[in-house]
Interface confidence: low
Amino acid sequence: QTSVSPSKVILPRGGSVLVTCSTSCDQPKLLGIETPLPKKELLLPGNNRKVYELSNVQEDSQPMCYSNCPDGQSTAKTFLTVYWTPERVELAPLPSWQPVGKNLTLRCQVEGGAPRANLTVVLLRGEKELKREPAVGEPAEVTTTVLVRRDHHGANFSCRTELDLRPQGLELFENTSAPYQLQTFVLPATPPQLVSPRVLEVDTQGTVVCSLDGLFPVSEAQVHLALGDQRLNPTVTYGNDSFSAKASVSVTAEDEGTQRLTCAVILGNQSQETLQTVTIYSFPAPNVILTKPEVSEGTEVTVKCEAHPRAKVTLNGVPAQPLGPRAQLLLKATPEDNGRSFSCSATLEVAGQLIHKNQTRELRVLYGPRLDERDCPGNWTWPENSQQTPMCQAWGNPLPELKCLKDGTFPLPIGESVTVTRDLEGTYLCRARSTQGEVTRKVTVNVLSPRYE
């Protein structure tokens, strides 16, 4: 009778094991082991027992002990089971961004590993098991479907293999894949709202605002604002699930015409875009031209108003005849025209909007000087010792200098409050002088003495 010890062995791949072959007869003709494995016999006293070291065990094997005794030949097998953990445990690559509500398929591939009967594949979200299946096939593949939710944002998905050799008196060997970190997002189907001027004047600044609600996570949203080829640099304000991107846009003469304004919101691997057209125009203020800005009384003056070729002008409220970009009027300058404003208003239609521009010029009329009865009475009669203020106003542009003298030396205190005395009486010569000339006027002051009874 041949026996073998141990009858069952589990060992790591490439490992060694000692196998003892024994026989029940004292003097066996033969005692040995049959195996393709490298073997080394350990010398022992006696004939009925042999110990062999079997090495580099790479796969399951069944070495067979045999003996030949007088009563016949017999054999006994030992079962060697090799274990090894998988060479590769990997989740199939996936885009890190996944839209909420989408079904996400996780696929884990496992290469190698034995014994397969003890090898299990586990798909996990964090530490929560999603699926557990025995490893079957080479490579073994396990899949599961996950409905993507908001609260998965930042969650780690992984695949773990478990080689459970605890029933064989060993341990549980685990291998885990690199985690796949899921980033979930919600990008609404509605395009972003874009608020901007429909028309924009050259060499001015406009404000563009792009906003969108219902985003998740709003912190990950990217906003791209552009006018034509000009990339805008917005200030982005984030809310709970919304953002508002505000940018200043400056345009030059090179941008004149119709430009495309774009707002694109990129979140995850999706984007939403809104397009709008902005008309960039050039419209200088109209020009008001006076023959001369300063003329003498009686001079003929031409006032012209000129504007953008496509504009329509009115000059002092009177539309150009025919309606167009030019208007003019003629006048003979009078003192009443001094300081008169000539206002030109130009209107230009740009992309259905009416744009208005104004320009005003003032006319200066030189006249005078003037001294007349109304503003400089020729006769004053005042009671003696009364308080009086002699008034005499000279008119003209420029404003004349006024002096009133009696006998060429004694001044009349114009505009000052005085106590009337006898020596105030007399005839004064008032002289108004300016660059435009000189006028004189006689003013008589009579002083009434009090009557004594």
Epitope: S96, R125, G126, E127, K128, R149, R150, D151, H152, H153, G154, A155, N156, Q181, Q183, F216, P217, S219, E220, N240
Partner: antibody
Framework: QVQLQQSGPELVRPGVSVKISCKGS????????IHWVKESHAKSLEWIGV????????NYNQKFKGKATMTVDKSSNTAYLELARLTSEDSAIYYC????????????WGQGTTLTVSS | DVVMTQSPLSLPVSLGDQASISCRSS???????????LHWYLQKSGQAPKLLIY???NRFSGVPDRFSGSGSGTDFTLKISRVEAEDLGVYFC?????????FGGGTKLEI
């Protein structure tokens, strides 16, 4: 508006357990996770862990495993934090906060629950 | 665990001053997706913390633009351009790139 209403202060004896609550309102409760944070004089602010309001999935700071248990009742929009085998070291203010699973910041916080462990 | 170190511990300021708070992490906070998940919170006396800035430089809803954040990797800064009375309190930085999430020790902004 978003609100996280926490249960009132607790004065308990050492060795017992306590369960504090955090009720969310003003938003879709299951769309967010609830994080728990401990504030103590000794350690400032410490993250205890996070629980998915939808699935009940949890991720604990290793330091609080065995001490803290997070649960959720989505029918009442309420998250719970249970602290076991209390000692004076557990005396602190505990906050719940709304956030994403792991990466996102905590955009809204509860008012805090003061826990005093004393014999 | 990632250790977050804030400085200074206390920051005395006058109203209208600029204030600057530094936060350093023991590991890079650059996530595999390229983002730095570094956030700033303000806790006023007797209140819960409130989110000011998330992901380094994004102001949260309702946070005035005098608050700004910058930095990448391991060095981050919070700046307040003109301190107002309502800004006083303890400022915390926090990271969520690595698990467990961790907080800085806090910087007290006081008059």
């Amino acid at each position: 508006q978003v609100q996280l209403q926490q249960s009132g202060p607790e004065l308990v004896r050492p060795g017992v357990s306590v369960k504090i609550s955090c009720k969310g309102s003003g938003y879709t409760f299951i769309d967010y996770a609830i994080h728990w944070v401990k504030e103590s004089h000794a350690k400032s602010l410490e993250w205890i862990g996070v629980i998915s309001a939808y699935s009940g999935d949890t991720n604990y700071n290793q330091k609080f495993k065995g001490k803290a248990t997070m649960t959720v009742d989505k029918s009442s929009n309420t998250a719970y934090l249970e602290l076991a085998r209390l000692t004076s070291e557990d005396s602190a203010i505990y906050y719940c906060a709304r956030g994403g699973w792991l990466l996102l910041s905590f955009d809204y916080w509860g008012q805090g629950t003061t826990l005093t462990v004393s014999s | 665990d990632v250790v977050m170190t804030q400085s200074p511990l206390s920051l005395p300021v006058s109203l209208g001053d600029q204030a600057s708070i530094s936060c350093r992490s023991s590991q890079s906070l650059v996530h595999s997706n390229g983002n730095n998940y570094l956030h700033w919170y303000l806790q006023k006396s007797g209140q819960a913390p409130k989110l000011l800035i998330y992901k380094v430089s994004n102001r949260f809803s309702g946070v005035p633009d005098r608050f700004s954040g910058s930095g990448s990797g391991t060095d981050f800064t919070l700046k307040i351009s003109r301190v107002e009375a309502e800004d006083l309190g303890v400022y915390f930085c926090s990271q969520s790139t690595h698990v467990p999430l961790t907080f800085g020790g806090g910087t007290k902004l006081e008059i």
